[in-house]
Interface confidence: low
């Protein structure tokens, strides 16, 4: 008869708000205090079979006690009544869990949106964490007629998506009960015309056509989504280059009514340009459309817009009366050269009379001229025609340059090797900027480069390595021939040289030592050689250093010790650290020349 | 937010009495869902739990203790201590004091512990 | 007193393995089991109470299974911060509070 429990916990099943109080109580049947000899200050209660301290009891009555507790922080707390029975053995009377968690807040940020060709989807913001099962339920209603509620998905409690088709210029009203064990609450109402709350298909069929009459525009055509048929549309238009990552858009007014086909100005010729297009009601109400597929068009070529960077280098042996002339020019970037260019062509005027028209695949041209005076033009041409023409003079033999430019400097910044000047006060037309690595072990290989005439300011165009030196000389090109050039050493990034010097004795008296040695070569420096250090010591002494200047290949070592073996070595400083060279042994003499012991 | 912090000496002779003292800040020791206690963990080893104290005084311990532990509260400092007198090798240990929490029935907060060692 | 015994003492895993380590009960303990993480050098840290309540603030990667007298952890995805000792504790006949050896959790 024992076997029904000995008495009860009340509440039964309690679920309570978070940071709460909360008081059970229990209640022992007169049977089982009868068999067990036992009443209510015989019970034991215990959260997790943990003894819960006596001063959290009350005794009610003989039959019944109760727990209380402050602020329960726990999600499930397992809370039993137990009574001490004969010999202090422990029977458990009842057993609950004490569910907590918090009443549901009232949700927020109601909006809801119909994607062409389904149905209207609403969400939500649920606002805090409640612990407890909560249903989310989305009400609707026309003035005349109530829709059926959609309940919102264990897994996707903060949306729901209608079961009714949507009517479109009707007003309808929407909002979202939430409901758990400690509470219901109800948002705001929102009421709205579905034709609002639209997002359209992209439009398809994106297409783009060139014009060969224009090289800056591309057509694009397109299909509208249905959705066309209910509301008008207005559009945004992107595009970029092939190569770039950033989009460019097109004015929103020009896009800003239904259409199928817009014409896109002001694009650069001979360029793949990518495009894509979306959609939304014209009025601005309602969604932007995901983006259609993207389309890839080419302009049209047009004439290079620009003359090639043109030079030229003179052999200097030549024959009696002619010279070899190395005529050089660069090719277009893509933004100048507007298609592909098929063709040079290079006129060679001595004097006013006509001389010769050459027509080139190459990117160089080797002539021989004679000692006068010649103007060379050089052209590009693509399938559209020709570029502007470049125009240099090749001045005659006894030709005296003059008026370079001054002060010169070059650089490092950035990564990158700078050079500027002062202008001359003549009018320069343009400035030749040649560049080559100095080196013992090769021979300098100039590359070179144009700039304006107006420019006193410019890096070096070219894959430059550090630790070298670039031997920069910048010419300016004045109508009747090229300025005196003048020239620059520099480096893109110094290091500490490879090697350090080699010292070695010139002469070496009683007291005094002159120590020599070579400049380091130009492929061990590394940067600018600004000074040296001389360290010498003795096998028992202590070292010293002498500081000498970068210019010197040798220095006397004074007020040494006679009949002594010194240790010399020597270190060379860029602006980026020193090396030091081998060491060096010398014993000097016992007596000085023609001394006698 | 609560904090636990241990403090007390770091070397003990044998046969002397190991004190220390847990100080608990951001909250109040006196709480009623909450006992405060004592874990061990020698060098290497496992967790042993020594004891556990109510906010009023009320007191439980390891069984294989009993007879050498002492834990009590100072309510008015905030803090709660342990005493373990007749130390030898064995009782060198990281000490740990804890919270209890009735609710959940775990330890829910911890101190960093303090290493002690036994030896002359 | 309650014995609790771990399986296995060790155990090497790669980094988005699936780990579970089981603790025994020596009578049954209904779901009175908790389960710790522990760092070198640092405290235990409570991971699961009452055989399978995710403590506040603990990744959802941890899970706590059983009842009785058998109980496991489980991680799903290993993640590389999860490398540590794990212990369980019981706390259905108390006092005393009795803990498992240990599982010493090392990355493979």
């Known amino acids: 008869e024992l076997l029904d429990p000995c008495g009860y916990i009340s509440p039964e099943s309690p679920v309570v708000q978070l940071h709460s109080n909360f008081t059970a109580v229990c209640v022992l049947k007169e049977k089982c205090m009868d068999y067990f000899h036992v009443n209510a200050n015989y019970i034991v209660w215990k959260t997790n079979h943990f003894t819960i301290p006596k001063e959290q009891y009350t005794i009610i009555n003989r039959t019944a006690s109760s727990v209380t507790f402050t602020d329960i922080s726990s999600l499930n707390i397992q809370l039993t009544c137990n009574i001490l029975t004969f010999g202090q053995l422990e029977q458990n009377v009842y057993g609950i869990t004490i569910i907590s968690g918090l009443p549901p807040e009232k949700p927020k940020n109601l909006s809801c949106i119909v994607n062409e060709g389904k149905k209207m989807r609403c969400e939500w913001n649920r606002g805090r964490e409640t612990h407890l099962e909560t249903n989310f339920t989305l009400k609707s209603e026309w003035a005349t007629h109530k829709f059926a509620d959609c309940k919102a998905k264990r897994d996707t409690p903060t949306s729901c998506t209608v079961d009714y088709s949507t009517v479109y210029f009707v007003n309808i009203e929407v909002w979202v009960e939430a409901e758990n064990a400690l509470g219901k609450v109800t948002s705001d109402h929102i009421n709205f015309d579905p034709v609002y709350k639209v997002k359209p298909n992209p439009p398809h069929n994106l297409s783009v056509i060139n014009s060969e009459e224009l090289s800056s525009i591309l057509k694009l055509t397109w299909t509208n989504p249905s959705i066309k048929s209910v509301i008008r549309l207005k559009y945004n238009i992107q595009y970029r280059t092939k190569d770039a990552s950033t989009w460019s858009q097109i004015p929103p007014e020009d896009t800003a009514s239904t259409r199928s086909s817009f014409t896109v100005q002001d694009l650069k010729p001979f360029t793949e340009y990518v495009f894509r297009i979306c959609c939304m009601k014209e009025d601005g109400k309602g969604y932007w459309s995901d983006w259609s597929e993207e389309a890839n068009g080419i302009t049209y070529e047009d004439r290079p817009s620009k003359a090639p960077s043109f030079w030229y280098k003179i052999d200097p042996s030549h024959a009696q009366g002619y010279r070899t002339v190395q005529l050089m020019w660069k090719t277009l970037p893509p933004f100048e050269a507007n298609g592909k260019i098929l063709d040079y062509e290079v006129t060679l005027t001595r004097w006013k009379s006509h001389l010769q028209n050459y027509t080139v695949n190459d990117t160089k041209l080797t002539v021989n001229l004679t000692n006068d005076r010649y103007v060379a033009t050089l052209t590009a041409r693509n399938l559209v025609g020709k570029s502007d023409a470049a125009v240099l003079t090749i001045p005659a033999c006894d030709f005296q340059a003059t008026h370079p430019v001054m002060d010169l400097k070059a650089f490092p910044k950035d990564n990158m090797l700078w050079v500027e000047w002062t202008t001359p006060r003549e009018s320069v037309k343009k400035y030749i900027l040649e560049w080559c690595v100095l080196s013992d072990k090769a021979p300098c290989i100039a590359d070179w480069q144009q700039e304006d005439g107006t420019v006193h300011r410019t890096h070096l165009r070219g894959n430059l390595a550090e630790s070298k030196c670039y031997l920069i000389t910048v010419t300016p090109v004045y109508a009747d021939g090229p300025g005196s050039p003048e020239s620059i050493k520099a480096y893109l990034k110094q290091a500490p040289p490879s090697k350090g010097p080699t010292v070695r004795t010139k002469k070496v008296g009683k007291n005094e030592a002159v120590l020599e040695w070579d400049q380091l070569p130009v492929d061990v420096q590394n940067g600018f050689i600004r000074n040296y250090t001389i360290f010498y010591r003795t096998i028992i002494g202590n070292e010293t250093a002498v500081n000498v200047d970068s210019s010197h290949t040798e220095y006397t070592l004074s007020s040494l010790t006679s009949d002594t073996l010194y240790m010399v070595r020597m270190a060379a400083y860029t602006d980026e650290g020193g090396k030091d060279g081998p060491e060096f042994t010398f014993t000097t003499p016992k007596f000085a020349q023609g001394e006698i012991e | 937010q609560l904090q636990l912090q241990e403090s007390g000496p770091g070397l003990v002779k044998p046969s002397e009495t190991l004190s220390l003292i847990c100080t608990v800040s951001?909250?109040?020791?006196?709480?009623?869902?909450?006992?405060w206690g004592w874990i061990r963990q020698p060098p290497g080893k496992g967790l042993e739990w020594i004891g556990n104290?109510?906010?009023?005084?009320?007191?439980y311990y390891n069984p294989s203790l009993k007879s050498r532990v002492t834990i009590s509260v100072d309510t008015s400092k905030n803090q709660f201590s342990l005493k373990l007198s007749f130390v030898t090798a064995a009782d060198t240990a990281v000490y740990h004091c804890?919270?209890?929490?009735?609710?959940?029935?775990?330890?829910?907060?911890w101190g960093q512990g303090t290493m002690v060692t036994v030896s002359s | 007193d309650i014995q609790m015994t771990q399986s296995p003492s060790s155990l090497s895993a790669s980094v988005g393995d699936r780990v579970t380590i089981t603790c025994r009960a020596s009578?049954?303990?209904?779901?009175?089991l908790n389960w710790y993480q522990q760092k070198p050098g640092k405290a235990p840290k409570l991971l699961i109470y009452?055989?399978?309540s995710l403590q506040s603030g603990v990744p959802s990667r941890f899970s706590g299974s059983g009842s009785g007298t058998d109980f496991t952890l489980t991680i799903s995805s290993l993640q590389p911060e999860d490398f540590a000792t794990y212990y369980c504790?019981?706390?259905?006949?108390?006092?005393?509070?009795?803990f498992g050896q240990g599982t010493r959790l090392e990355i493979k």
């Open positions: 804890a919270r209890w929490d009735t609710n959940g029935g775990a330890f829910d907060i």
């Open positions: 951001g909250g109040s020791i006196s709480s009623n869902n909450y006992y």
């Open positions: 104290l109510y906010g009023s005084g009320s007191t």
């Open positions: 009578q049954s303990i209904s779901s009175y």
């Open positions: 009452a055989a399978s």
């Open positions: 504790q019981q706390s259905y006949s108390t006092p005393p509070i009795t």
